[in-house]
């Protein structure tokens, strides 16, 4: 008879035997035989394995290096890796969050469309007509031009995307 060529999902094929995989959080010490079960051992401190596996070594937890602006968002367990995030004012450079960069500021003429998070940078947008931003900021949105009319004033200097309108008194009619 032919030896098996496939095994069930929580098993693996070795020496014509279907052996049980090790559960998440444990590593393989020895394969099963006809009479002995697969031997598994828990991962050590600062190690993990997140799947049913036949690994002989556990993976090291990720190190959140403060020199790269990283801090621990979620501590790793024997079954999960550590999740890093960035210090306040910084965001990850990649999905794996291996390093951080300072949030970008929106230049004058641009406002913040979306404030940065630990994993995404600031999103800026040009100030449309009727709005302005005169500062470089990672938080400020475009502000609407001042409405001179509501203050019983007139526009003395038109606004731009970087400057507000300048209001002044209405010309008095001479008698």
């Amino acid at each position: 008879p032919e030896p098996p060529t496939a095994c069930r999902e929580k098993q693996y094929l070795i020496n014509s035997q279907c052996c049980s995989l090790c559960q998440p959080g444990q590593k393989l010490v020895s394969d099963c035989t006809e009479f002995t079960e697969t031997e598994c051992l828990p991962c050590g401190e600062s190690e993990f394995l997140d799947t049913w596996n036949r690994e002989t070594h556990c993976h090291q937890h990720k190190y959140c290096d403060p020199n790269l602006g990283l801090r621990v968002q979620q501590k790793g367990t024997s079954e999960t890796d550590t999740i890093c995030t960035c210090e306040e004012g910084w965001h990850c450079t990649s999905e794996a969050c291996e390093s951080c960069v300072l949030h970008r500021s929106c230049s004058p003429g641009f406002g913040v469309k979306q404030i940065a998070t630990g994993v995404s940078d600031t999103i800026c947008e040009p100030c449309p007509v009727g709005f302005f931003s005169n500062v470089s900021s990672a938080f400020e949105k475009c502000h609407p031009w001042t409405s001179c009319e509501t203050k019983d004033l007139v526009v003395q200097q038109a606004g731009t995307n970087k400057t507000d309108v300048v209001c002044g008194p209405q010309d008095r009619l001479r008698a």
């Epitope: 069930r8 999902e9 559960q23 598994c40």
Partner: antibody
């Protein structure tokens, strides 16, 4: 309620073909490995085929290899057994065909876990006769 | 392929009796063995998995033991509803195989 319901059985001539279906309900079908098991009249149980949860891995009893094909459609919660192929259906394929769910019993405090077939359909009868 | 041999093939017993059915494997299968009960016209019902673990809802009078090549199913005190055919199955490797069955009849 967790249920399996087979259909597609009937009378078929030797050399003919048939497709059996097994409709699953009450559980996340796509997460489970599945099997077909048959029982000839007055005889014992015979394992026929296995399919993994994704459908990627299949296996067959030597008696049906090359003649039967197991497949599944997880979007429809359906398991199939196509009875055809070289020297297709024979008189000895006459049996009640059951679909059965493979379950992996696991207690995280225990060492290894174990498989068993915990849910069975009522069966569909296939009669191969001229 | 792994062969499973059940003994006895049939057994007559009375309500209240202690009954033992054995299943021998042609090669070591560790504890990858399940036991099923089947009544006429019905599908099999899982009783024991992993050689000795009782499936939920199965009465505690049923127990399984063994490892390697020799396994037993014990019913500590037979009840009228226990008269049926019992099968062992190895889930160690493909092809999965069943024993030929043990028919338990009322005396």
């Amino acid at each position: 309620e967790v249920q399996l319901l087979e259909s597609g059985g009937g009378l078929v001539r030797p050399g003919g073909s048939l497709r059996l279906s097994c409709a699953a309900s009450g559980f996340t079908f796509g997460s489970y490995e599945m099997n077909w098991v048959r029982q000839a009249p007055g005889k014992g149980l015979e394992w026929v085929s296995y399919i993994s949860s994704s459908g990627e891995t299949t296996d067959y009893a030597d008696s049906v290899k090359g003649r039967f094909t197991v497949s599944r459609d997880n979007s429809k919660n359906l398991l199939y057994l196509q009875l055809e192929g070289m020297n297709s259906l024979r008189a000895e394929d006459t049996a009640v065909y059951y679909c059965a769910r493979d379950v992996f019993f696991f207690d995280s405090s225990g060492d290894n876990g174990a498989y068993g077939m915990d849910v069975w359909g009522q069966g569909t009868m296939v009669t191969v006769s001229s | 392929d792994i062969q499973l041999t059940q003994s006895p093939s049939s057994l007559t017993a009375s309500v209240g009796d202690r009954v033992t059915i054995t299943c021998r494997s042609s090669q070591g299968i560790r504890s990858s063995l399940a036991w099923y009960q089947q009544k006429p016209g019905k599908p099999p019902k899982l009783l024991i998995y992993g050689a000795s673990s009782l499936e939920g809802g199965v009465p505690s009078r049923f127990s399984g033991s063994g490892s390697g090549t020799d396994f037993t199913l014990t019913i500590s005190s037979l009840q009228p509803e226990d008269f049926a055919t019992y099968y062992c199955q190895q889930l160690n490797s493909f092809p999965s195989t069943f024993g030929q069955g043990t028919k338990l009849e009322i005396k």
